[in-house]
């Protein structure tokens, strides 16, 4: 008996060939011996089965001895053994129809779980193997669960259902709603304008929701809201902005915030939260601001940084074109009685300069 696997909603063709390449009488029946379709004279006739309105045959191939049955818009309950009667012989084809669907909306927030459920005919024992767009392989039986979706899980998932050494492939498009980056750090000299950008890792035709940037300044005892906003069809409108600092926000996506100037009291870390309408949960992106200040006061040249820096970062004071350097894995370095000239303050990570500020030391007479 031949086994054919089909996909719910799809079309399947069950083949039946006569030994002689000519038009002859044939019938397709189900396991209950109920006629589905056949030939009478030169015409296709249909029997009283449930399939009659969805079953057809390729008339153009009859004179070649091909008497296939095409079933459209497959249902799980179409799974059955079908019998083709031609030239006094019977050919049996077992059709197994499977369906694979996501248990919820296919637009899911990062961190949420995805469950794929396999619909299968009674008595079957299929196995399912799914491959994510990022190459992650997940195996299961009737259900496949991905407990925590990541950004890279966005895209087309390819799932293969296997039964009796036969396979059928399903493709499911999953959109993971997330920001492109989980975290970003902006390094700025004191007084410079700061640009924060929060690009999304997905596109939706209608994007509506609301959000807030909540900020914990390093020098502040508690965190506070810097800005709240609404998003209506990709248009951004500010709801409330704190008076200090007075942030500005772009009216279009990607979400874009401008801090007029970087000051030590603003250095710290923030969390931009975005709630999308009709979605449970929220999108988050962490943003850090590191501010550098180089100052000369009397005989002391100081360079300081504020904000979240890793302990492995190096802060250096260096006299241009000279070897004089002082370096520390600290948030402040200083030189007493510095030589006259252009000094550079550098914040670096394994030799890569993240931030620099120049200060001119004039000779004291």
């Amino acid at each position: 008996k031949k086994v054919v696997l089909g996909k719910k909603g799809d079309t399947v063709e069950l083949t039946c060939n006569a030994s002689q390449k000519k038009n002859t009488q044939f019938h397709w029946k189900n396991s209950n011996q109920i006629k589905i379709l056949g030939i009478q004279g030169l015409f296709l006739t249909k029997g009283p089965s449930k399939l009659s309105d969805r079953a057809d045959s390729r008339k153009s191939l009859w004179d070649q001895g091909c008497f296939s049955m095409i079933i459209k818009n497959l249902k799980i309950e179409d799974s059955d053994t079908y019998i083709c009667e031609v030239e006094n012989k019977k050919e049996e084809v077992e059709l197994l129809v499977f369906g694979l669907t996501a248990n919820s909306d296919t637009h899911l927030l990062e961190g949420q779980s995805l469950t794929l459920t396999l619909e299968s005919p009674p008595g079957s024992s299929p196995s399912v193997k799914c491959r994510s767009p990022g190459g992650k392989n997940i195996q299961g039986g009737r259900t496949i669960s991905v407990p925590q979706l990541e950004r890279q899980d966005s895209g087309t998932w390819t799932c293969t259902v296997s039964q009796d050494q036969k396979t059928v492939e399903f493709k499911i498009d999953i959109v993971v709603l997330a920001f492109q980056k989980a975290s970003s750090t902006v390094y700025k000299k004191e007084g410079e304008q700061v640009e924060f950008s929060f690009p999304l890792a997905f596109t939706l035709e209608k994007l509506t929701g609301s959000g807030e940037l909540w900020w914990q300044a390093e020098r502040a005892s508690s965190s506070k809201s810097w800005i709240t906003f609404d998003l209506k069809n990709k248009e951004v409108s500010v709801k409330r902005v704190t008076q200090d600092p007075k942030l500005q926000m772009g009216k279009k996506l990607p979400l874009h915030l401008t801090l007029p100037q970087a000051l030590p009291q603003y250095a710290g870390s923030g969390n931009l939260t975005l709630a999308l309408e009709a979605k449970t949960g929220k999108l988050h992106q962490e943003v850090n601001l590191v501010v550098m200040r180089a100052t000369q006061f009397q005989e002391n040249l100081t360079c300081e940084v504020w904000g979240p820096t890793s302990p492995k970062l190096t802060l250096s004071l260096k006299l241009e074109n000279k070897g004089a350097t002082v370096s520390k894995q600290a948030k402040a370095v200083w030189v007493l009685n510095p030589e006259a000239g252009m000094w550079q303050c550098l914040l670096s990570d394994s030799g890569q300069v993240l931030l620099e500020s120049n200060i001119k030391v004039v000779p004291t007479w």
């Epitope: 506070k224 709240t228 200090d244 709630a275 949960g281």
Partner: antibody, heavy 119, light 106 residues
Framework: EVQLVESGGGLVQPGGSLRLSCAAS????????MSWVRQAPGKGLEWVAN????????YYVDSVKGRFTISRDNAKNSLYLQMNSLRAEDTAVYYC????????????WGQGTLVTVSS | IQMTQSPSSVSASVGDRVTITCRAS??????LAWYQQKPGKAPKLLIY???SLQSGVPSSFSGSGSGTDFTLTINSLQPEDFATYYC?????????FGQGTKVAIK
Amino acid sequence: EVQLVESGGGLVQPGGSLRLSCAASGFTFSSYWMSWVRQAPGKGLEWVANINEDGSEKYYVDSVKGRFTISRDNAKNSLYLQMNSLRAEDTAVYYCVREGGQWLALDYWGQGTLVTVSS
Amino acid sequence: IQMTQSPSSVSASVGDRVTITCRASQGISSWLAWYQQKPGKAPKLLIYAASSLQSGVPSSFSGSGSGTDFTLTINSLQPEDFATYYCQQANSFPWTFGQGTKVAIK
């Protein structure tokens, strides 16, 4: 520790005036919007008014517009509610509230002061 | 914006799951908070942004919804949870509260 302490409540005749005060401590008062919320005896909560950090923006519920004035003195860490032309329906416990929660939530509340308008 | 809470009161036992709904007369996105008030005390913030738990609030409390329909769920009612609960919108002025739901001991 954030603390909000209301004062100035009491018994007043219809048409009379009263000034409520709220002393704030434990946070940078000048960095937050503040609100007044009231609750009539045995009834639900009703937001009355709010004011931004420097006092340049003020909003009121329709039923008190033109009669109540919200103000603040950041130097004194104080919030005020001047209530004029008082009516019997203004009888309530008045709460001083900080709008410091995430997503504009009202995160800290005073213990309330009772205002009774009766002849 | 009018906020309508239901039910206005509910009788429940310790360990029960209690669900309170709040409906806004127009869309308020996620600008919704839930408060708990005990007799003679000031209200206390439980949930902000429709579903985010305020720091220090037990995880037995949860919120959901966006737009016009919102829900507060108390998963396993504790003796200290018998109180009145209010929803409040912060989408547009004037801020408005629901009429309250009293959770009483059965």
